[in-house]
C-alpha cells in the first residue's frame, strides 16, 4: 500500500551519477569541485568551496517536503497527499526523511502492488462469505440454485 | 458536484491592488490545495503558485514572488489571491484550480471560471 | 525551468481522422518510474478542462476517444477518431518541478 522508495532512490542516485562521472564515487559536482552530498532532509543551498568539502545544505519544508536519501539536489521532493477521491487516506505521515505512506480508506480496497488509487469494496446481495480488506474485494455468497 | 466560482470582471487601476476571490462547493476545501494560473490575452497559461488550506502553507512560481500573496478563509471555503502594483502586463484572466494527486503527480482537475483583470487608467 | 515545446502549433484534421500533438520537455519529468505529465483542452471563453493526468491516465467523464503516451522527455496525445466537438487548443503540463510549467499550445481544427 505505502509508497515504494527503492525505486526512487536508484532514479535520484542514476540521475546525480549522470553529472558526476568526474568525482569519486560518493562525490558530486558542484562547480569546479566534488562535493559531499547533503545529508537526507536537506536540500543543497550552495556548492562546496573545495574539493571533498561539505555544501551548505538547509532543510526541506516539513510536512510539506522530503528527502530520503543522500543527494546533491537543490530541491527537495513534495510530499505525496493521500487523495481521498481515488480512496486513500494517510497511513503514515511525511517526515523530512520519509515520504507520506497512504493506505485504503475504510471500506476501500486496492489488489495490485503500489496503488495509486483504491476502488469502494463491493456489498453483497445474498450475504458475505468473506470481508473486504485493504487488499481483496469481498467475497460474496452466490444466490441458491433454489431461491431463483 | 464540484465547483469553483470567480467573480467575471475586476477593472484596475495601475498602481493599484486587486484581490481576487475563488469560493469552492462540493468538497471538502481543506482536503485539496489550490493552484491559480494567469493567461494573457491570447496566449499560454502560466503557473502562479498553490495554497494548502489545511495550514496556509504556500508555494510561489518564483516570477509572481512580491506580485501574488495567496489566502484562504476555510470558513467560508474560499481561496483569495491579492496581486499587489499592477501594470498592463497584469491584465490577465486569472484561474483558481482545484489540485489531484496521482501517485505524486498534482494535476488539476476542476477550474474556476476565470476572473478577468483588466488594468487601466 | 522546464520547457515544453508543443508541435504543430496548429493543425487540421478531417472528422473521423487522427489527430496527434507532441509535446516535448527541456528535460526529463519522469521519476521513479512515473511520468510527471498532464494535457488540458481549452475552448475560447472557458477555462482549461483535465484530460489526461500522469501521461496516459484518462479522467473520469473524458471520451476514451482521447489517449496520452509517453515518458521522458516526449509525449503524445492523440484524439481518434476527432469529432466537431473537438475543436480547441491543447496544452500538455508537467508536475515533476517547480516551478510546474505548460506549453505553448496546440490549435485543433476540424475539417
Known amino acids: 500500500q505505502g509508497t515504494n522508495s527503492i525505486s526512487e532512490s536508484l532514479k535520484l542516485r542514476r540521475r546525480v551519477r549522470e553529472t558526476d562521472k568526474n568525482c569519486s564515487e560518493g562525490l558530486y559536482q558542484g562547480g569546479p569541485f566534488c562535493c559531499q552530498p547533503c545529508q537526507p532532509g536537506k536540500k543543497k543551498v550552495e556548492d562546496c568551496k573545495m574539493n571533498g568539502g561539505t555544501p551548505t545544505c538547509a532543510p526541506c519544508t516539513e510536512g510539506k517536503e522530503y528527502m530520503d536519501k543522500n543527494h546533491y539536489a537543490d530541491k527537495c521532493r513534495r510530499c505525496t497527499l493521500c487523495d481521498e477521491e481515488h480512496g486513500l487516506e494517510v497511513e503514515t505521515n511525511c517526515t523530512l526523511t520519509q515520504n507520506t505512506k497512504c493506505k485504503c480508506k475504510p471500506d476501500f480496497y486496492c489488489d495490485s502492488p503500489g496503488c495509486e488509487h483504491c476502488v469502494r469494496c463491493a456489498s453483497c446481495e445474498h450475504g458475505t462469505l468473506e470481508p473486504c480488506t485493504a487488499t481483496s474485494n469481498t467475497n460474496c455468497r452466490k444466490q441458491s440454485p433454489r431461491n431463483r | 458536484q464540484v465547483q469553483l466560482q470567480q467573480p467575471g470582471a475586476e477593472l484596475v487601476k495601475p498602481g493599484a491592488s486587486v484581490k481576487l476571490s475563488c469560493k469552492a462547493s462540493g468538497y471538502t476545501f481543506t482536503s485539496y490545495w489550490m493552484q491559480w494560473v494567469k493567461q494573457r490575452p491570447g496566449q499560454g497559461l502560466e503557473w502562479i503558485g498553490e495554497i494548502d488550506p489545511s495550514d496556509s502553507y504556500t508555494n510561489y512560481n518564483q516570477k509572481f514572488k512580491g506580485k501574488a500573496t495567496l489566502t484562504v478563509d476555510t470558513s467560508s471555503s474560499t481561496a483569495y489571491m491579492q496581486l499587489s502594483s499592477l501594470t498592463s502586463e497584469d491584465s490577465a484572466v486569472y484561474y483558481c484550480?482545484?489540485?489531484?494527486?496521482?501517485?505524486?503527480?498534482?494535476?488539476?482537475?476542476?477550474w474556476g471560471t476565470g476572473t478577468t483583470v483588466t488594468v487601466s487608467s | 525551468d522546464i520547457v515544453l515545446t508543443q508541435s504543430p502549433a496548429s493543425l487540421a484534421v478531417s472528422l473521423g481522422q487522427r489527430a496527434t500533438i507532441s509535446c516535448k520537455a527541456s528535460q526529463s519529468v519522469d521519476y521513479d518510474g512515473d511520468s510527471y505529465m498532464n494535457w488540458y483542452q481549452q475552448k475560447p471563453g472557458q477555462p482549461p478542462k483535465l484530460l489526461i493526468y500522469?501521461?496516459?491516465n484518462l479522467e473520469s467523464g473524458i471520451p476514451a476517444r482521447f489517449s496520452g503516451s509517453g515518458s521522458g522527455t516526449d509525449f503524445t496525445l492523440n484524439i481518434h477518431p476527432v469529432e466537431e466537438e473537438d475543436a480547441a487548443t491543447y496544452y500538455c503540463?508537467?508536475?515533476?518541478?517547480?516551478?510546474?510549467?505548460f506549453g505553448g499550445g496546440t490549435k485543433l481544427e476540424i475539417k
Open positions: 500522469a501521461a496516459s
Open positions: 484550480a482545484r489540485n489531484r494527486d496521482y501517485s505524486n503527480n498534482w494535476y488539476f482537475d476542476v
Open positions: 503540463q508537467q508536475s515533476n518541478e517547480d516551478p510546474r510549467t
